[in-house]
């Protein structure tokens, strides 16, 4: 009888085992395990009748189509075999075991005890056949295996071969190289590659196969396995295969498709081709006079571009438009896109106007073309060129006037400072009282009028200031502070400030320049209790024109010591003290409550310690700080007073031969102005030079070298 076994393991015994088996018996065991496994059979006990070639009793092990072993006896002899330690391994997943005993047994034979089990087949080691083995990588697992591919490859639907995705290759450059995947290594199997060359209309693609050409072929049938086909419009060239490359191909088209097919077998190295665009030829070009063409070639074809440029100092002129370069292109019909332009000499045109300056031409006929020269100069003596610049500008190749230091920037004509049009009196002789100032003696002197019309009654007061530049006035902070607030320092509104310059006699304002304020800047640390940091600036709405009666004063160098004791300085002012005078009266009527004509006084700087002591000896908390200095005479008689507030205390600098503002009229008291041992207190300007420059937005180097000692 037959026993069907489907387990992954099991035991087979002869009938009656462990007793002796019966005579004339036949049993077949058919063992089937899943695919991917084979069957291993071994015997733990074996005792059968022995016979020549196992004719009587035997155990036969076989598969569907072959006998794997026949066993009998008790021990192995030349003609019969017992399994002993031997293991029988099926080649596949099926094994049949047949036990047969003949009709007579002279002895009692105990038969056999066998065991079987399913064992995994390592397909990766055992597959020899290329048709079945993995193309790249094989991975065994219990009961089966699977294939995978190298990076860049995709497993084919046959789950065995590795192909590439190569159907989306677009080439748009005018030249290029195309190869089979992985060239020069063998190309992948089971792949369909598509290469598209798509150039601009007007080009024609030429193909040339190079180096190795190795595509699997067949001795009789043309290219049945792997091949290249070239599709040009409706026309198909090929298939091509084997080891001989096709001849160069002129497609006469701007669009070409290359198809490459590989089947699932073979190891061939593939192919490489280069393509090149060909186009119509354009006529030879002649460069313009004073110009050149780049690139310079013997021949130019469709899509070639040339750049026309001119020699230094010349510009490309095309249709009356000047440009640096001009590009023309060879068109598909073999003509140039434009005519060659001409080269025209660069013209810098009329140079820019210089504020407070003039221009002279160095070149004849006032030429403004390349390499022409001009010279800027400032309106002397009121303006001086910043940094002593030469003012010489040359017409550059770029068409702009260029200076060696400033480049294309115009020079700056800075107001000359501290140089009155009229000489101030000698300081050798001491002047006891104030005296009238001649016009032009204090050209920096400003009258500041503050008139607050926002309240009833209108509030108004006056002070002095000093012109620092065409746009800035230096004064004392207390002049520009609203007294309505005491616990906080609030500047007056700029709308309420008017500045008069070039004013000599307040009865005659015709020659004066009046300006409104664009900004009022009080020193941020101004202290109303002790007048420390009593300094402020007014920016004028418009720069004022400079002249003999309106010129700035120089700022000192930054020096904490300030002016030296006993040095003589001058202060000017109108000494306005009557509050009940209208602005119109002040400016035009020349009322008797103030000086009609600008007054000035000559005062010595008082040693700091002496001044401090003189104020400390008075009742009250007067403090003469390091930001102040004093000037005046012990015996009194000359002093500055209320309306002079903010006015400049100037000292002549011998080295630069200029007048420098060292102080601003700040405070004094408690006795009347000009009293004995009541020195006037002045803001020490040299402590604030950096702050002043910062507010004015000018570099410190602008004027400072002019007052170096």
């Amino acid at each position: 009888h037959t026993v069907e076994l489907n387990n992954m393991f099991g035991q087979i015994q002869s009938p009656g085992y462990p007793d002796s088996y019966p005579s004339d018996s036949e049993v077949t065991w058919n063992i089937t395990v899943p695919d991917g496994f084979r069957i291993k059979l071994y015997f733990m006990h074996f005792n059968l009748e022995s016979s020549y070639l196992c004719e009587y009793d035997y155990v036969k092990v076989e598969t569907e189509d072959q006998v794997l072993a026949t066993f009998c006896g008790r021990e192995t002899t030349d003609t019969e075999q017992t399994p002993g330690q031997e293991v029988v391994l099926s080649p596949g997943s099926f094994m049949s075991i047949t036990f047969r005993s003949d009709f007579s047994n002279e002895e009692r034979f105990t038969g056999f005890d066998a065991h079987y089990m399913a064992v995994d087949v390592d397909e990766c080691k055992e597959r020899e056949d290329e048709e079945l083995s993995c193309d790249h990588y094989c991975h065994n697992y219990i009961g089966g295996y699977y294939c995978s591919c190298r990076f860049g490859y995709i497993l084919h639907t046959d789950n065995r071969t590795c192909r590439v995705e190569c159907s989306d290759n677009l080439f748009t450059q005018r030249t290029g190289v195309i190869t089979s995947p992985d060239f020069p290594n063998p190309y992948p199997k089971s792949s369909e590659c598509l290469y598209t060359i798509e150039l601009e209309e007007g080009f024609m693609v030429n193909l040339q196969f190079e180096d190795i050409f190795d595509i699997e072929d067949h001795p009789e049938v043309p290219c049945p396995y792997d091949y290249i086909k070239i599709k040009v419009g409706p026309k198909v060239l090929g298939p091509f295969c084997g080891e001989k490359a096709p001849e160069p191909i002129s497609t006469q088209s701007h669009s070409v498709l290359i198809l490459f097919h590989s089947d699932n077998s073979g190891e061939n190295r593939g192919w490489r081709l280069s393509y090149r665009a060909a186009g119509n030829e354009c006529p030879e070009l002649q460069p313009p006079v004073h110009g050149k063409i780049e690139p310079s070639q013997a021949k130019y074809f469709f899509k070639d571009q040339v750049l026309v440029s001119c020699d230094t100092g010349y510009k490309v002129l095309k249709d009356n438009v000047e440009m640096d370069t001009f590009q023309i292109e060879c068109l598909k019909d073999g003509t140039w896109s434009n005519k060659i332009p001409t080269c025209k000499i660069v013209d810098c045109r009329a140079p820019g106007e210089l504020e407070h300056g003039l221009i002279t031409f160095s070149t004849r006929n006032n030429l403004t073309t390349y390499k022409s020269e001009i010279k800027y100069s400032c309106q002397e003596p009121y303006y001086k060129m910043l940094n002593n610049n030469t003012g010489i500008y040359t017409c550059s190749a770029q068409g702009v006037w260029m200076n060696k230091v400033l480049g294309r920037s115009l020079p700056t004509c800075l107001p000359e400072c501290g140089q009155p049009s009229r000489s101030l009196p000698s300081l050798v002789k001491r002047i006891i009282g104030g005296r009238n100032a001649e016009p032009g003696l204090f050209p920096w002197q400003a009258l500041i009028v503050v008139e607050d019309t926002s309240r009833v009654p209108n509030d108004k007061w006056f002070g002095s200031g000093a012109l620092l530049s065409a746009s800035w006035i230096l004064t004392a902070a207390h002049v520009l502070r609203s007294q309505r607030r005491d616990t906080t320092v609030i500047p007056v509104s700029k709308e309420h400030v008017t500045v008069y310059l070039g004013l000599h006699d307040v009865r005659d304002k015709s020659g004066a320049v009046n300006s409104s304020a664009a900004r009022v800047v009080l020193h941020p640390d101004f202290n109303i209790q002790n007048y420390n940091h009593d300094i402020a600036l007014v920016q004028l709405q418009e720069p004022v024109p400079l002249g003999p009666h309106v010129m700035p004063v120089c700022l000192p160098r930054l020096e904490p010591e300030g002016p030296a004791p006993h040095m003589l300085g001058l202060v000017a002012g109108w000494g306005i003290s009557n509050p009940n005078v209208t602005v119109d009266e002040i400016i035009s009527s020349g009322t008797r409550t103030l000086s009609d004509v600008l007054q000035y006084v000559k005062l010595p700087v008082v040693p700091h310690a002496e001044c401090k002591t003189s104020y400390e000896s008075r009742s009250g908390n007067y403090s003469v700080t390091e930001n102040m200095f004093c000037a005046g005479y012990y015996e009194g008689g000359k002093d500055t007073c209320l309306g002079d507030s903010g006015g400049a205390f100037v000292i002549f600098d011998d080295l630069s031969q200029r007048w420098v503002v060292q102080g601003l009229v700040s405070w004094g008291g408690p006795e009347e102005c000009g009293s004995k041992q009541v020195y006037g207190v002045y803001t020490k300007v040299s402590n604030y030079v950096d702050w002043v420059w910062e507010q004015m937005g000018l570099p410190q180097s602008v004027v400072e070298p002019q007052v170096e000692r």
Partner: antibody, heavy 116, light 112 residues
């Protein structure tokens, strides 16, 4: 030290005038305005106005426009309050106080009595 | 004019105890520059006034730190943490933001 010293008490008949002074010392006089404040007997304080000591311009509260005048003599650092056409209801202590809005230091006060 | 209202109008305090005075204005005292000009002064019996606090909370020099000021907009407070005998008198608040400057009606502080 900062001091405001006012003139002494005044006894005036109705219709007369009076001028009260307030001498300042111990600080930069033109740095601060000067306020005037009235205190009627047993009553609270009432701000009368102030004078800008730099410009000399006075500003009056509405109730004190007309008969009241603030003035200044900068040379002696003294502001003045003058009241004309005195009435019985002007009887009060008048204080000067340093500052337009600060009023950080006060005079000792001047009693003006208006009685027939 | 801005009306300044003080509460209470009188206050009797045991020495060492705290005291608080409120001052309300009829409109905000914050000016366009962001400052609040609210001040407090004390007028002791028979004396001229003396300023204690300015700009809401800043103490004048020489004023003991038991005094403090607070508030914003229209509501302000003067506090005395521990009242002493010398603190008796009339306390006034006043504003210097809106012209004309105006005083509160005063708060009389006396010792129990």
């Amino acid at each position: 030290q900062i001091q405001l010293v006012q003139s002494g008490s005044e006894l005036k008949k109705p219709g007369a005038s009076v001028k009260v002074s307030c001498k300042a010392s111990g600080y930069i006089f033109t740095s601060y305005g000067m306020s005037w404040v009235r205190q009627a007997p047993g009553k609270g304080l009432k701000w009368m106005g102030w004078i800008n000591t730099y410009s000399g311009v006075p500003t009056y509260a509405d109730d004190f426009k007309g008969r009241f005048v603030f003035s200044l003599d900068t040379s002696v650092r003294t502001p003045y309050l003058q009241i004309s056409s005195l009435k019985a209801e002007d009887t009060a202590v008048y204080f000067c106080a340093r500052g337009g809005e600060a009023m950080d230091y006060w005079g000792q006060g001047t009693l003006v009595t208006v009685s027939s | 004019d801005v009306l300044m209202t003080q509460t209470p109008l009188s206050l009797s305090v045991t020495p060492g105890q705290p005291a608080s005075i409120s001052c309300k204005s009829s409109q905000s005292l914050l000016d366009s520059a962001g400052k609040t000009y609210l001040n407090w002064l004390l007028q002791r019996p028979g004396q001229s006034p003396k300023r204690l606090i300015y700009l809401v909370s800043k103490l004048d020099s020489g004023v003991p730190d038991r005094f403090s000021g607070s508030g914003s907009g229209t509501d302000f407070t003067l506090k005395i943490s521990r009242v002493e005998a010398e603190d008796v008198g009339v306390y006034y608040c006043w504003q210097g933001t809106h012209f004309p400057w105006t005083f509160g009606q005063g708060t009389k502080v006396e010792i129990k």
